[in-house]
Every structure is written in C-alpha cells, then in structure tokens.
C-alpha cells in the first residue's frame, strides 16, 4: 500500500477520535483496518464507511473510500478492510482504457458481422465477421443492424483494493 | 506535484546561529512529518528531527537536542530549522523531506525531497 499511493486516494484530515480503536503496532506495522501513531506507539482503527486500509501498514491514515459515480451501481460497501466496489449499470461497460468512465455498450453489430458477446459491465458486445471469425475492433460503426443485445449483468468490481 | 524549496544555508563561526526554512507545496496528504536530514562531506545521511503536521510531534537526533529547533508555520506550509551553537561537525548539506509514515528517522520512510542547501562552520 506504500508505492502507489495518490493524493486524491487519501482521507480529509482528521485527528484521531476518543472512540477510535487503539493497539500496538507490530514491528512497526498495523494490521489492515488501521492506520499508525505520529510517535509510532499506537494502531488507530479506520472510520467504517469512510476510510481503509487492506494491508499491514506503518501509514499515518487511512485511504479514503471510493464513491460511486452516477451511472454505477455499488455491489459492496466500504468497510475498515476494503474499498467499496462499484459497477457499470446494466446496458454500459468500463474498459481498460478509459477506467473513469461508464461508456454505453453498442445496440447491434456492424454490417457482415454477428454478435458473439454480450454487453457486460467490463465489456461492450463483441462482434465477429461473418466469414472470417475475425474480430471487430470495436469502433462504433457509420451504419449498424439492428441485431440487439441483452445487456448481461454479471458482478464484477470496478475498483479493487486487493 | 510535491515540491520542496530549503534556503538560509551560509557560513557561520563556530558557535553562531543560522536558520534554514523549508517551502513545501503541493502537498494534500492529512497528516505527515517534515523532517530535516545532512550529509556531512564524505559521510551519510544523517537524521537531524522531524515534525508531524496533523499532531505536531517532534523528534530530534542526540547530536542536535538542545542545540537545534525544529518548528513549522502551517499556514506558509514551511518548516524550520533554528540552529545554535553550532559546531564544525554540523557542517553539511541540509536536506528537507516529507514522509506519510510514523516514527520516522530512516531515509528510507521519506518520499519527497528537496535540493538541499549547504552550512558551512568555520573560524
């Protein structure tokens, strides 16, 4: 958890509560759900539904939970331990790409090409050539058919903290 | 981007005063420590103190205690090293850095860095 922090990743500031939970770190390390004492001594307990940490750590907060933006669904809550987990609604999909945003799946497959995957939340419809079996690249066609699909909507996490 | 700017460094006599300042942006994280480190010619990074800015803790080498002064202005976001009774082992290039890890002494806790500046201790 030390490497690949960003700024924006971390909580508002904030002192830690009387009702915090406190223990004793660990050569030098709390456990995940807590963060470190400025002087090193204490493990003080994340804020459930606000921050967490998923691993050992000697930080001096917890990392801020994610929200979920609109156009998501959110599959689990943030707890001390675990980031929320958020994803697509039905009919939009996330790629690899472009992370930050739901993008809507296509209705239909261009001309010459049927459907062999449906739209799930981390996939658009995937389209193939009739003949060769050849994938399509997945630029939205000048002209589609009118070949729909049913949206999928298996579970899939949009953003892990593992 | 996290920048940090060190200036006050000089010559001074032996049992003078100086003070460094630390100019320190970009910084967003809600808690972390500042600290100042050396590196005396031909030798290593040495810890000198470190201030934390959520609780104000402040740690200090052996070497320095009683003689150094580690404060902090939180509204310029800049820290300070007020020295006295300096030696000519205190000569050095001072370092400003900032951790987000507590209890931190060791280099290796520091993510940010700054250029340094140079005091120099002679008669």
């Known amino acids: 958890e030390s490497a690949l922090i960003t700024q924006q990743d971390l909580a508002p500031q904030q002192r830690a509560a009387p009702q915090q939970k406190r223990s004793s770190p660990s050569e030098g390390l709390c456990p995940p759900g807590h963060h470190i004492s400025e002087d090193g001594r204490d493990c003080i307990s994340c804020k459930y539904g606000q921050d967490y940490s998923t691993h050992w750590n000697d930080l001096l907060f917890c990392l801020r939970c994610t929200r979920c933006d609109s156009g998501e669904v959110e599959l689990s809550p943030c707890t001390t331990t675990r980031n929320t987990v958020c994803q697509c609604e039905e009919g939009t999909f996330r790629e690899e790409d472009s992370p930050e945003m739901c993008r809507k799946c296509r209705t239909g497959c261009p001309r010459g090409m049927v459907k062999v995957g449906d739209c799930t939340p981390w996939s658009d419809i995937e389209c193939v050539h009739k003949e060769s079996g050849t994938k399509h690249s997945g630029e939205v066609p000048a002209v589609e058919e009118t070949v729909t699909s049913s949206p999928g909507t298996p579970a899939s996490p949009c953003s892990l903290s593992g | 981007e996290v920048q940090l700017l060190e200036s006050g460094g000089g010559e001074v006599q032996p049992g003078g005063s100086l003070r460094l300042s630390c100019a320190a942006s970009?910084?967003?994280?809600?808690?972390?420590?500042m600290s100042w480190f050396r590196q005396a010619p031909g030798k290593g990074l040495e810890f000198v103190c470190a201030?934390?800015?959520?609780?104000?803790?402040?740690y200090y080498a052996e070497s320095v205690k009683g003689r150094f002064t580690c404060s902090r202005d939180n509204a310029k976001n800049t820290l300070y090293l007020q020295m006295s009774s300096l030696r000519a082992e205190d000569t050095a290039v001072y370092y400003c850095?900032?951790?987000?890890?507590?209890?931190?002494?060791?280099?290796?806790?520091?993510?940010?860095w700054g250029q340094g500046t140079l005091v120099t201790v002679k008669p």
């Open positions: 201030i934390y800015w959520s609780g104000g803790t402040v």
């Open positions: 970009g910084l967003t994280f809600p808690n972390y420590g």
């Open positions: 850095a900032v951790t987000i890890r507590g209890a931190a002494t060791q280099t290796w806790k520091y993510d940010y």
